[in-house]
């Protein structure tokens, strides 16, 4: 570690100053101060190779990556970058360190990656690795549509205020629970803004830009329904309009709704009624409840009241700031490779999240359903029994949760071997972790079961590949041992799996595989 | 050059909240993948790791104190924030703040650079 | 929660001394442990990490080993600057733990 150079990697963010930015002069920017970026040997990695933390960067920001290198003489450097190499001219600072600079201008989604430093000095070589990603912030954007009285009109206007333009719709549907899923037959869409039809048993507005689509219910307590278990619970922050509706069907037209809030009868211009007579002769009344602009004294209980049915109520809290409220521990779980298992995460949300569960660098949907008790659960069962870390996260603007799975699949090992001059090494990533045994075969042991008790070297678990662990067992190779054959079997309680090696002279080397147990 | 530095009431007394801060320089938690640990050592006992926070706002807290603490960053401030919450004699100890740096390959590393450290004395 | 068993709790050495300090966890951690030195009304200091890595500036006389469940920290040659308290830390599994200390006390 001594002899290693001292490196230090830094990050220079530069407030672009448009008119000279992508000029080649030295530096067309104003600079902020540089931050560590905390360059580190990598663990386990063949030859010297130093990391530095993720840069995380906003579209169009221009950074400089910078490497100060402590080491006598002088040094000459590659950068390589998406296979292809970039020119490296190294100078030196006032206190002698070699400075090695790589300046991004105006960061686009083709510049996110791996930057690879090749550096070269008198005394040793060695890489540097910077891995830089785009910040998620994105320029465009896309809200959740909420609702406006139309001026003098018994209708509701739904606005997004997004970018780009959204396309806003009303979905519809009469139905009740599962027949009101997006694409059910119940379901009917009016691309409009306006909806006057305000009778239906489940209203919603969706806005919908190049970002995606966002959606928002209309609340709603109906007198007709056996209530809920547990109370229902509307949330909203501070300054959002709030819309309650209060919904009965009646014999005749002989009742009448009314809406409490604490047991006070809401002040006028606070709510508006609507009614109609259905098909079959039966009277529905509708009675909105409403605030342009909520305030924490908005909290509290609304009640709908009618003369002639049991009323019901609904909380509706007022918060500050959106919340993701679950627990955030990370869980861990051993399945057998044939087991039907799912992932689940049980959350309260607001506003509604957007969620992805990752594995292995790669994105998968993210499916939420809401539970009667005002919590709402993602399940994600399409790990195909793939061990490792999975990762649920979930933002909805104003808080981020993540929460770590790792997902361990109890199977017998599987060995692959490979071999060099020096030695010969065997892997294995069965679950529990495989232990090791070396054996050679001679004409004293056909078999092989002469155990070779010298020159082995394990290194259990010693990588993790997207949380996968991995067993490796090493054999040091003796003069007397080449031409003979070894035999690594690595076993763990589901079984043992062996692979033989010749060892010979550098070259192709024939593996026989063995019998799995 | 990285620095960390806590701050925060010398003494405190039973059943109020603790506020402590770690002011950091030299890096920040804006534009690369940058963590702070809180870690806590009663007069001659063990060290005891109590929550860390990440750039990407993720959080983690010790099981035994989970339901006392809150951890929180400001970015502007390079700032990161524990709250402990009904605090007992039994909380006497010295408060450090440590760094955690996080890797594009996986790996982390804890703890290269710490603070000096903050006595907080639990007491009526 | 895993725990972390150091072991000796104390030791006494001389200067030039090899000395050995183990730490095992309860459950197995691949190579997610670090060891660190603290001296008395000091911060600790990160001697090693991912087991076996050593940080930047320490010197080499100090060495880390081992995977799974079984830790040791070797120091070479003991030095007068080395007496001090160490503690291995894993971050393999929330919450991360820290194990009791090993005092290295000179003879």
């Known amino acids: 570690n001594q002899d290693l150079p001292v490196i230090k990697c830094v990050l220079i963010n530069h407030k672009n100053n448009d008119s000279s930015v992508g000029k080649s002069s030295s530096y067309p920017m104003v600079s902020e101060s540089p931050e560590d970026l905390g360059c580190a040997l990598r663990p386990q990695s063949a030859g010297t190779v130093y990391e530095a933390a993720t840069v995380e960067v906003d579209v169009s920001a221009s950074i400089t990556l910078q490497v100060l290198v402590d080491t006598p003489g002088n040094i000459s450097c590659l950068w390589v970058f998406k296979h292809s190499s970039l020119n490296c001219q190294p100078h030196f600072d006032v206190q002698n360190r070699g400075v090695v600079s790589m300046v991004i201008l105006k960061m686009t989604e083709t510049q996110a990656g791996e930057y690879l430093l090749f550096i070269q000095s008198e005394a040793t070589n060695y890489t540097i690795v910077f891995t830089v990603s785009i910040r998620n912030t994105l320029l465009f954007t896309l809200r959740r549509p909420y609702f406006r009285k139309m001026e003098n009109q018994d209708a509701l206007v739904c606005i997004s205020e997004s970018v780009p333009e959204p396309i806003v719709e009303w979905v519809l549907c009469d139905s009740q629970g599962e027949s009101c899923k997006e694409e059910s037959p119940a379901v009917v869409k009016k691309e409009e803004k306006v909806l006057h039809e305000l009778f239906g048993t489940d209203i919603r507005c969706c806005a919908r830009n190049e970002l995606g689509r966002e959606c928002t219910r209309l609340f709603t307590i109906d007198l007709n329904q056996t209530p809920q278990t547990t109370l229902p619970q509307l949330f909203l922050k501070v300054g959002e309009p709030l819309w309650i509706r209060c919904k009965a069907v009646h014999v005749n037209h002989g009742f009448g709704l009314t809406w409490e809030l604490e047991n006070k009868a809401l002040e006028e211009g606070s709510y508006f009624e609507m009614s109609t007579y259905s098909t079959n002769r039966t009277m529905i009344r509708i009675l909105f409840a409403f605030v342009s602009s909520v305030a924490r004294n908005d909290t509290g209980y609304y009640t709908c009241s009618s003369s002639k049915h049991p009323s019901q109520s609904a909380l509706v809290t007022i918060v500050e700031k959106g919340f993701i409220n679950a627990t955030n521990s990370s869980e861990d779980y051993e399945i057998d490779q044939y087991e039907e298992f799912c992932f689940s995460v049980r959350f309260k949300a607001y506003p509604q999240i957007r969620c992805t569960w990752t594995f292995s660098r790669k994105a998968f949907p993210c499916e939420q359903k809401a539970l009667d008790d005002g919590y709402s659960v993602s399940k994600f069962c399409n790990h195909k029994h793939q061990p490792g870390e999975y990762i649920f996260h979930a933002e909805n603007g104003d808080a981020q949760f993540t929460k770590m799975f790792t997902l361990n699949i109890r199977r017998k090992p599987q060995v692959l071997a490979e071999a060099s001059a020096s030695q010969a090494s065997c892997s294995s990533d069965g679950y529990p972790l495989p232990s090791w045994t070396w054996k050679k075969c001679s004409d004293k042991s056909p078999n092989c079961t002469e155990d070779i008790p010298e020159g082995v070297w394990n290194r259990k678990a010693n990588r993790k590949v997207f949380g996968q662990w991995v067993s490796s067992s090493t054999l040091n190779m003796s003069e007397a041992m080449k031409g003979f054959l070894v035999k690594c079997c690595a076993y763990n309680s589901l079984g043992t799996s062996c692979e033989t090696i010749l060892l010979n002279s550098p070259g192709p080397f024939p593996f026989i595989q063995d019998s799995i147990s | 050059q990285v620095t960390l530095k806590e701050s925060g009431p010398v003494l405190v007394k039973p059943t109020e909240t603790l506020t402590l801060t770690c002011t950091v320089s030299g890096f920040s938690f804006n534009n690369a993948r940058m963590g702070v640990n809180w870690i806590r050592q009663p007069p001659g006992k063990a060290l005891e790791w109590l929550a860390h926070?990440?750039?990407?706002?993720?959080?983690s807290y010790s099981t035994s104190l989970k339901s006392r603490l809150t951890i929180s960053k400001d970015i502007s401030k390079s700032q990161v924030v524990l709250t402990m919450t009904n605090m007992d004699p039994v909380d006497t100890a010295t408060y450090y703040c440590a760094r955690i740096v996080g890797y594009g390959s996986g790996w982390r590393l804890l703890g290269d650079y710490w603070g000096q450290g903050t006595l907080v004395t639990v007491s009526s | 929660a895993i725990q972390m068993t150091q072991s000796p709790s104390s030791l006494s050495a001389s200067v030039g001394d090899r000395v050995t300090i183990t730490c095992r966890a309860s459950q197995g951690i691949t190579n997610d442990l670090g060891w660190y030195q603290q001296k008395p009304g000091k911060a600790p200091k990160l001697l090693i990490y991912?087991?076996?890595s050593l940080q930047s500036g320490v010197p080499s006389r100090f060495s880390g080993s081992g995977s799974g469940t079984d830790f040791t920290l070797t120091i070479s040659s003991l030095q007068p600057e080395d007496f001090a308290t160490y503690y291995c830390l894993q971050d393999y599994n929330y919450p991360w733990t820290f194990g009791q200390g090993t005092k290295v006390e000179i003879k």
């Open positions: 926070i990440f750039s990407n706002d993720e959080k």
């Open positions: 991912a087991a076996s």
